[in-house]
Interface confidence: medium
Amino acid sequence: MAVTACQGLGFVVSLIGIAGIIAATCMDQWSTQDLYNNPVTAVFNYQGLWRSCVRESSGFTECRGYFTLLGLPAMLQAVRALMIVGIVLGAIGLLVSIFALKCIRIGSMEDSAKANMTLTSGIMFIVSGLCAIAGVSVFANMLVTNFWMSTANMYTGMGGMVQTVQTRYTFGAALFVGWVAGGLTLIGGVMMCIACRGLAPEETNYKAVSYHASGHSVAYKPGGFKASTGFGSNTKNKKIYDGGARTEDEVQSYPSKHDYV
């Protein structure tokens, strides 16, 4: 029960985190700048990974995409790449984790397979979260070190226009969304990895073989299994011979230490 809860919670937390990473990547407010501020009018410039916008106190707003790749700072390209990798890994992780969820039955998928898938998705969420945190942190560092260029200087592909005023940018809302989302994805990934340990069947030094004896004086073990021996090489713990048909609910799986919480 605790394993299922941990896995489910990890999935939900990661889902929220990845949604946040997508939102942050699409947002325009990665950096904000007060271009001009007086009692009559105020002009704000805010920039994202894909376009730059201007908003005036009068209500006028305009956004423009970055038309050129060559004129953009290499660091901005790196941030874009990190965020996209984070989204892609996160999306794949979500897809894998859906099939790995203990509460969802797909054919005759065994716990070991689900454990492996849970671990895989967990690792993907962790890397996804780290990519997002790294991307946002690189961008924040650009702002702190004043590396971020002023609006017009970025658009060298548009005719080499030169900005007349160089002003400092401040952190935009997208940075905080990205940090929180990356953290949530990371936490979700860790939770999935923890859940994986509970899903994995207990490894022992011997492999048990269950069988049905052919007599009437057979002592039944609790849960429907008959007497077992501690030898043989049947690694899957499958019954070699089943004398009578039995429903799936009657079959008891081997308990692990994680089942008792």
């Epitope: 271009l35 001009y36 548009m158």
Partner: nanobody, 122 residues
Framework: EVQLVESGGGLVQPGGSLRLSCAAS????????VGWFRQAPGKGLEFVAA????????NYADSVKGRFTISRDNAKNTLYLQMNSLRAEDTAVYYC???????????????WGQGTLVTVSS
């Protein structure tokens, strides 16, 4: 490199109309937002109107709203400012400017024309 040349200025009576033009040289004109600024004698630079690169959105100063209309023809690389119901306080040198955004902020504009004088007097 974009170069801007204004024309159409002159003397006009109060209540009259005038149409200013701004011809741009350079193939990248359509990439830029363009605007009009004015400077009255002894005063600072004042925003008049601006239009986005596509012409899809315009931005006007409160003092000219309803009287002035800005437009552009990207095929002809030309910007226009139709001025109606002119007043004495509209007397100024009018400058055409090219920038990335159609904002009232003069610092946004990297290219400037030499200006054309508009005098409103009876």
């Amino acid at each position: 490199e974009v170069q801007l040349v204004e024309s159409g200025g002159g003397l006009v009576q109060p209540g009259g109309s005038l149409r200013l033009s701004c011809a741009a040289s350079g193939r990248t004109f359509s990439n830029y937002a363009v605007g009009w600024f004015r400077q009255a004698p002894g005063k600072g630079l004042e925003f008049v109107a601006a239009i986005t690169w596509s012409g899809g959105s315009t931005n006007y100063a409160d003092s000219v709203k309803g009287r002035f209309t800005i437009s552009r023809d990207n095929a002809k690389n030309t910007l226009y400012l139709q001025m109606n119901s002119l007043r004495a306080e509209d007397t100024a040198v009018y400058y055409c400017a090219g920038g990335f955004f159609a904002t009232s902020y003069s610092g946004n504009y990297g290219y400037w024309g030499q200006g054309t004088l508009v005098t409103v007097s009876s």
